[in-house]
């Protein structure tokens, strides 16, 4: 997985994909995609979209293309998690979800993908030139990270191509194991996605999916994202930065896993199952840059496969470690 890759080799479905293709054409590509993915090295994709309804609002979607079980997902902004990034959300498949301002809603979309809505105004608000990174910790493959951002002049509501575009490599054994039929299928999938890319946005249809019910298809676009496709171009202020000590909440709290309502720890049971309830409101924990650890004379704490997050009353920090904040 390259954090620098720009080649749009394979992209997650774009908003409006369902409208662009019928149900029949949706099924085959995803079956094929699943097969294509199993042959390669784990990859992470990131998609960033600016919502036109609120110009300071972003939706970040990330997914893991791999066969291992996901232990933890960490979303950060301002750079990768070990290189100056500030943690926005940590999602554990069993212990639940934790988020920090300006994150508004983080949730599991499927067992291997998540979404995060960001909003805000002032110093902590996201902007078009912000880099967002997602790191997936998976057993036994390890930790995989990718980053993406919107170009400064992006049309509101339209998503930037996922960056880095996952490039699915396969070793010789993987290649030999894939039949000609599967190879054709992968090519066909790419053809469908590319063909969709050049289609006009579909006519809007009201979403029939209640947010409280599991969705029939993981990629069904929300009403908000559908509406966003038809809002005129607007420019946004790009002078923003991640919140640091002077803009974040100054006080910590007890270990948040212990206080999570049970619904927040809902684990999706199937590939298309969605976390069915809104997660707790953003916490009042300090979200700081890595450098502050050095001042305290301590190494940035890591969290990992099992996670006991934030027992430290000072709260979580953006850590050098991959799996989350301790």
């Amino acid at each position: 997985m390259r954090t620098e890759a720009q080649v749009p080799a394979l992209q997650p479905p774009e908003p409006g994909l369902e409208g662009a293709m019928g149900h029949r054409t949706l099924v085959l590509p995803w079956v094929l995609l699943t097969l294509c993915v199993t042959a390669g090295t784990p990859e992470v994709w990131v998609q960033v979209r600016m919502e036109a309804t609120e110009l300071s609002s972003f939706t970040i979607r990330c997914g893991f293309l791999g066969s291992g079980s996901i232990s933890l997902v960490t979303v950060s902004w301002g750079g990768p998690n070990g290189a100056g990034g500030t943690t926005l959300a940590v999602l554990h498949p069993e212990r639940g979800i934790r988020q920090w301002a300006p994150a508004r809603q983080a949730r599991w979309e499927t067992q291997s993908s998540i979404s995060l809505i960001l909003e805000g105004s002032g110093a902590s608000s996201p902007c078009a030139n912000t880099t967002f990174c997602c790191k997936f910790a998976s057993f036994p493959e390890g930790s995989w990270e990718a980053c993406g951002s919107l170009p400064p002049s992006s049309d509101p509501g339209l998503s930037a191509p996922p960056t880095p575009a996952p490039i699915l490599r396969a070793d010789l054994a993987g290649i030999l194991g894939v039949s000609g039929v599967l190879l054709f299928g992968c090519v066909y999938l790419l053809h469908l996605l590319r063909r969709h890319k050049h289609r006009p946005a579909p006519r809007l249809q009201p979403s029939r999916t209640s947010p409280q019910a599991p969705r029939a298809r993981a990629w069904a676009p929300s009403q908000a994202s559908q509406a966003a496709l038809h809002v005129p171009y607007a420019t946004i202020n790009t002078s923003c930065r991640p919140a640091t000590l002077d803009t974040a909440h100054p006080h910590g709290g007890p270990s948040w896993w212990a206080s999570l309502p049970t619904h927040a720890a809902h684990r999706p049971q199937g590939p298309a199952a969605w976390a069915s309830t809104p997660i707790p409101a953003r916490g009042s924990f300090v979200s700081v840059e890595n450098g502050l650890y050095a001042q305290a004379g301590e190494r940035p704490p890591h969290t990992g496969p099992g996670l006991t997050l934030f027992p430290d009353p000072r709260g979580p920090r953006a850590m050098e470690g991959p799996l989350g904040v301790r």
């Epitope: 036994p140 995989w144 890591h302």
Partner: antibody, heavy 120, light 107 residues
Framework: EVQLQQSGPVLVKPGASVKMSCKAS????????MHWVKQSHGKSLEWIGI????????SYNQKFKDKATLTVDKSSSTAYMELNSLTSEDSAVYYC?????????????WGQGTSVTVSS | DIQMTQTTSSLSASLGDRVTISCRAS??????LNWYLQKPDGTIKLLIY???RLHSGVPSRFSGSGSGTDYSLTISNLEQEDIATYFC?????????FGGGTKLEII
């Protein structure tokens, strides 16, 4: 301070088994995967396998699949590796190493090693 | 399995020198390359992870670079305590594999 304290050197006879330990301290044991690595005398390092202390899941290098068994005891924050049907080829220093759980998939802290000598 | 090759098995240098140790992977490992040092007493420490990120507590005279299949570790100002054997390791696929090591000695 993160520390991995391994059990002492052992001398065993061919055909026997040995179980070595790696006691972790200074961090939450179940939050990091644990690797085991072999270093034969004067040679390079060979990855044996990895265990997730949170749930006991394991993954092995095919070469060591029938040789090593990885386990953990969460209550004592200790990882174990058992080697069976020992031969002279198994004489080596064995290290436990914590997974950094960071991109790069490095091993950020290592035990001091357990020396195993197989001799009749 | 991915093979990791450190072509130089031993290297002699003087204190204060700039030393570069190289490592090559048998396939693209996308920066999933880590560097370790092993002291004569057997102690192993992580120096660099993900090709170029410095591990906590490691002196800034150590740096890593590279991409694709070719990577290098540079010690900008060699000190006595740097005398050790250096190993590279790929974290891109399982099984994890290591280079053969480069033993650094003082002239």
């Amino acid at each position: 301070e993160v520390q991995l304290q391994q059990s002492g050197p052992v001398l065993v006879k061919p055909g026997a088994s040995v179980k070595m330990s790696c006691k972790a301290s200074g961090y939450i044991f179940t939050d990091y995967y644990m690797h085991w690595v072999k270093q034969s005398h004067g040679k390079s390092l060979e990855w044996i396998g990895i265990i997730n202390p949170y749930n006991g899941d394991t993954s092995y290098n095919q070469k060591f699949k029938d040789k090593a068994t990885l386990t953990v005891d969460k209550s004592s924050s200790t990882a174990y590796m058992e080697l069976n049907s020992l031969t002279s080829e198994d004489s080596a220093v064995y290290y436990c190493a914590r997974d950094s759980s960071n991109v790069g998939n490095a091993m950020d802290y290592w035990g001091q090693g357990t020396s195993v000598t197989v001799s009749s | 399995d991915i093979q990791m090759t450190q072509t130089t098995s031993s290297l002699s240098a003087s204190l204060g020198d700039r030393v570069t140790i190289s490592c090559r992977a048998s396939q693209d490992i996308s920066n999933y390359l880590n560097w370790y040092l092993q002291k004569p007493d057997g102690t192993i420490k992580l120096l660099i992870y993900y090709s170029s990120r410095l591990h906590s507590g490691v002196p800034s005279r150590f740096s890593g670079s590279g991409s694709g299949t070719d990577y290098s570790l540079t010690i900008s100002n060699l000190e006595q305590e740097d005398i050790a054997t250096y190993f590279c390791q790929q974290g891109y696929t399982l099984p994890r594999t290591f280079g053969g090591g480069t033993k650094l000695e003082i002239i």
